[in-house]
């Protein structure tokens, strides 16, 4: 098994991930591993010399780059925040800030926007992964209500008047809670929609 640098007549190398063809000398040379770059190119008698990327720079893959890529921070103007810092082997990992979702994708998320409000009577459908898509609002299930316009409010169960020693004055809806009243008092018209103790 030849070790780089070795001659290649057909311009291909055995390990394409970790070697590359150098046409000037017609040889296969080693690429540099992640986290490093080429500090000295190979020759017929000497393989590639690699050096570690300087602080705040990285190379993710086996490469024969003569520079490292500059680390870039997550852009808060685009609604992004950091998950993990840049290292010599990987760029900064970003995600959308809380309350936002990814509205534009390249290879990675590039721009986040505020999650849409869900209107009263609905809630955002729970997803496995928060933030990678906008809210999809679904109606509150039977016996539950939600009375605000909010991206994150959850439907709550209707109050059970009997659990508080009260009686029902008005049934709950998807947008409002049950109205309870003291069983001994009539409900005045101006007090409808409130709970009387």
């Amino acid at each position: 098994q030849a070790v780089p640098p070795y001659a290649s007549e057909n311009q291909t190398c055995r390990d394409q991930e970790k070697e590359y063809y150098e046409p000037q000398h017609r040889i296969c040379c080693s690429r540099c591993p992640p986290g490093t770059y080429v500090s000295a190119k190979c020759s017929r008698i000497r393989d590639t010399v690699c050096a570690t990327c300087a602080e705040n720079s990285y190379n993710e893959h086996w490469n024969y780059l003569t520079i490292c890529q500059l680390c870039r921070p997550c852009d808060p103007v685009m609604g992004l925040e950091e998950i993990a810092p840049c290292t010599s082997k990987r760029k900064t990992q970003c995600r959308c800030q809380p309350g936002m979702f990814c509205a534009a994708w390249a290879l990675e998320c590039t721009h986040c926007e505020l999650l849409s409000d869900c209107p009263p009577g609905t809630e955002a459908e729970l997803k496995d992964e928060v933030g990678k898509g906008n809210n999809h609002c679904v109606p509150c299930k039977a016996g539950h209500f939600q009375n605000t316009s909010s991206p994150s409010a959850r439907c709550q169960p209707h109050t059970r008047c009997e659990n508080q020693g009260l009686v029902e004055a008005a049934p709950g809806t998807a947008q409002s809670d049950t109205t309870c009243k003291n069983p001994l008092e009539p409900l005045p018209p101006e007090m409808s929609g409130t709970m009387l103790m």
Partner: nanobody
Framework: EVQLVESGGGLVQPGGSLRLSCAAS????????MAWFRQAPGKEREAVAA????????YYADSVKGRFTISRDNAKNTVYLQMNSLRPEDTAVYYC?????????????WGQGTLVTVSS
């Protein structure tokens, strides 16, 4: 730990088509952002296409737009790359990759690659 196995590579004439598959096994696959990268002889590795857990958020490199289509079947834990109107410059080893955070900023799982050769 996720294992990725690519298949579907081979020799094809210019203008022809190929469909690459990437089968994932191991941990939950549905929340991952998946991508296809390629490395041509003597070139650096480059991203070709990417897709979100739900089939949205697709990305294509300019060089393949309108010719390549990425898709996924979560029931089969498989990602596909349909390659049409292939050109000699598409010759490369194609790698499937997965980003476990789902955000696409670091692909931490890689397959071994499948070779695509476009030549007459």
């Amino acid at each position: 730990e996720v294992q990725l196995v690519e298949s579907g590579g081979g020799l094809v004439q210019p203008g022809g088509s190929l469909r690459l598959s990437c089968a994932a096994s191991g941990r939950t696959f549905t929340n991952y952002r998946m991508a296809w990268f390629r490395q041509a002889p003597g070139k650096e590795r480059e991203a070709v296409a990417a897709i979100n857990w739900n089939g949205g958020g697709t990305y294509y490199a300019d060089s393949v737009k309108g010719r390549f289509t990425i898709s996924r079947d979560n029931a089969k834990n498989t990602v596909y790359l349909q390659m049409n109107s292939l050109r000699p410059e598409d010759t490369a080893v194609y790698y499937c990759a997965a980003d476990s955070t789902g955000w696409g900023s670091y692909f931490d799982y890689w397959g071994q690659g499948t070779l695509v050769t476009v030549s007459s």
